[in-house]
């Protein structure tokens, strides 16, 4: 559960985030799992640890392997694993499946292609974009911040899109590329104001102290591919990542489902080892799209364990 696949190309920068997160003040130690050797933090090293991030500047094929990160707080340690694979650069234009990030779908009205993993890097706009290895040119293509917008999408726009950017580390520049497939759907859908199906508004969820608990935020947004629809959890009005409680984590990525033909998204909030103080928090399921934003609030209450009499 706390293991993450990461991949990159030799001679490019690769930055990996520890799958276990904590407050910025917590120390994070990194180890190469096979040898249990500590990863240095000095930036003069080609591979070094920087808090929650493990940096390969640049990466080499020999760096492949499993890396362990341990998030240390005054009261607990949390362990995560990063499974890193560095591949040799291909001589031809083909990008093999194992280098591809998740496929995105688009339509005439929805044609954003996000550059994968870019938020981990120190980069400056503009991004360079390529389709099937050809640099994209023409007014139909617009590189905007971390994504590419294609105007008047046609079926011929389907293909593999590569973003290329420069990571800067202490004045040194490293190239990074990432590729994902883009498919074009015939859009006969519609979108509407988010409708949160779960949890119910002001729901009280019973949990057992010391056990794990899951909360699911589920919302529907319309029919067909949905543009900029998202669901997420907030704790006491702040983002989960900003709240800084490592026991409480949002699942990475949103799961898409279809309910009565409607496009829905859900996001699971996992609370490990439920504590008394978790009962005092307010958990907000937030759903938003181009129409607006909706919230439902949940609170936790203690479930009394059933007494077992002999």
């Amino acid at each position: 559960k706390f293991s993450k696949q990461s991949w990159g190309l030799e001679n490019e920068a690769l930055i990996v985030r520890c799958p276990r997160q904590g407050k910025p003040s917590y120390t994070v130690d990194w180890y190469y799992s096979q040898t249990n050797k500590s990863i240095p933090t000095q930036e003069r090293n080609r591979v070094f640890a920087s808090g929650q991030l493990l940096k390969f500047l640049p990466a080499a094929v020999a760096d492949s392997g499993i890396y362990t990160c341990i998030v240390r707080s005054p009261t607990f340690n949390r362990t995560g694993y990063a499974n890193v694979t560095i591949y040799k650069k291909q001589s031809d234009c083909n990008v093999p499946d194992y280098l591809m990030y998740s496929t995105v779908s688009g339509s005439e009205k929805n044609s954003k292609i996000y550059c994968p993993t870019i938020d981990l890097y120190n980069w400056t706009a503009p991004l360079e974009w390529f389709k099937n290895c050809q640099a994209l040119q023409g007014s139909r293509y617009r590189a905007h911040k971390s994504f590419l917008v294609i105007d008047n999408v046609m079926t011929e726009d389907a293909g593999d899109y590569t973003c290329k950017f420069i990571h800067n580390e202490n004045g040194a520049n490293y190239s990074v590329t990432a590729t994902r497939s883009f498919t074009v759907k015939d859009e006969q859908g519609f979108s509407l104001f988010p409708v949160i199906g779960a949890p119910a508004q002001n729901e009280i969820k019973e949990v057992e102290i010391g056990k794990n608990a899951n909360l699911t935020c589920s919302a529907c947004f319309g029919k067909g591919t949905q543009f900029l629809a998202a669901v997420l959890w907030q704790l006491n009005g702040t983002k989960i990542t900003d709240f800084g409680e490592p026991r409480i984590q949002q699942e990475e990525g949103q799961n898409q489902s279809f309910s009565n033909g409607l496009a829905c998204l859900d996001m699971v909030l996992r609370i490990a080892d439920v504590k008394e103080e978790d009962l005092l928090l307010q958990y907000d399921c937030l759903a938003l799209n181009l129409h607006g934003l909706r919230r439902h609030t949940v609170r936790l209450s203690r479930k009394n364990p059933i007494d077992h009499h002999s």
Partner: antibody, heavy 122, light 107 residues
């Protein structure tokens, strides 16, 4: 020091257009959501429009939907409100306001400009 | 849309008085509530957010409380500069909505 300076207000006939601008300084403009709020003479505050820091999300009040468009130019640290098909009931002081949080959805406004008056009258 | 109802619409008080303004939401808004102060001819100023968090630089005589549908702004000891109009605002759902205002006047 955070500063927001609105401009572009004035007298316009019903059905006309205006473009309001808000020049921002003293903070990292591109990191924050921004909003427009208006206040008709002698009346209360009415939220008009908000835009997320990345420009993905642009929300408008029902009273202006389809007529007003919010946008931003991070390279110029400027927020805009394009107002078309203006009505007499759009007469108000228009305030530009900065989101109090990196998160667009917090909705709190921690710094406001001094406002620009828009008068719609024939 | 969520309606915000403030009471009273106006009140008269003296310097040193304890003043309480209430704001009621037409549906639960958790703690997504802010309070603003506005003086004539000036822009509004954020006082309290998340129902009870004091904005940086705001005097500690201002406090906020409440959750769900009922909220309160309290000024523990009214000062001359506090005579102004106050607004509550919800940001639980879009559209964000404001209360109709409470004017605090000198008795």
């Amino acid at each position: 020091e955070v500063q927001l300076l609105e401009s572009g207000g004035g007298l316009v006939k019903p059905g006309g257009s205006l473009r309001l601008s808000c020049a921002a300084s003293g903070f990292t403009f591109s990191s924050y959501a921004m909003s427009w709020v208006r206040q008709a003479p002698g009346k209360g505050l009415e939220w008009v429009s908000s835009i997320s820091s990345d420009s993905y999300y642009k929300y408008h009040a029902d009273s202006v939907k389809g007529r007003f468009t919010i946008s931003r130019d991070d390279s110029k640290n400027t927020l805009y409100l394009q107002m078309n098909s203006l009505k007499t009931e759009d007469t108000a002081v228009y305030y530009c306001a900065k989101g109090a949080d990196y998160d667009f959805w917090s909705g709190y406004l921690d710094y406001w400009g001094q406002g620009t008056l828009v008068t719609v009258s024939s | 849309d969520i309606q915000m109802t403030q009471s009273p619409s106006s009140l008269s008080a003296s310097v040193g008085d304890r003043v309480t303004i209430t704001c009621r939401a037409s549906q639960g808004i958790s703690s997504y509530l802010a309070w603003y102060q506005q003086k004539p001819g000036k822009a509004p100023k954020l006082l309290i957010y998340r129902a009870s968090t004091l904005q940086s630089g705001v005097p500690s005589r201002f406090s906020g409380s409440g959750s769900g549908t009922d909220f309160t702004l309290t000024i523990s000891s009214l000062q001359p500069e506090d005579f102004a109009t106050y607004y509550c605002q919800q940001s639980y759902n879009t559209p964000w909505t404001f209360g109709q205002s409470t004017k605090v006047e000198i008795k």
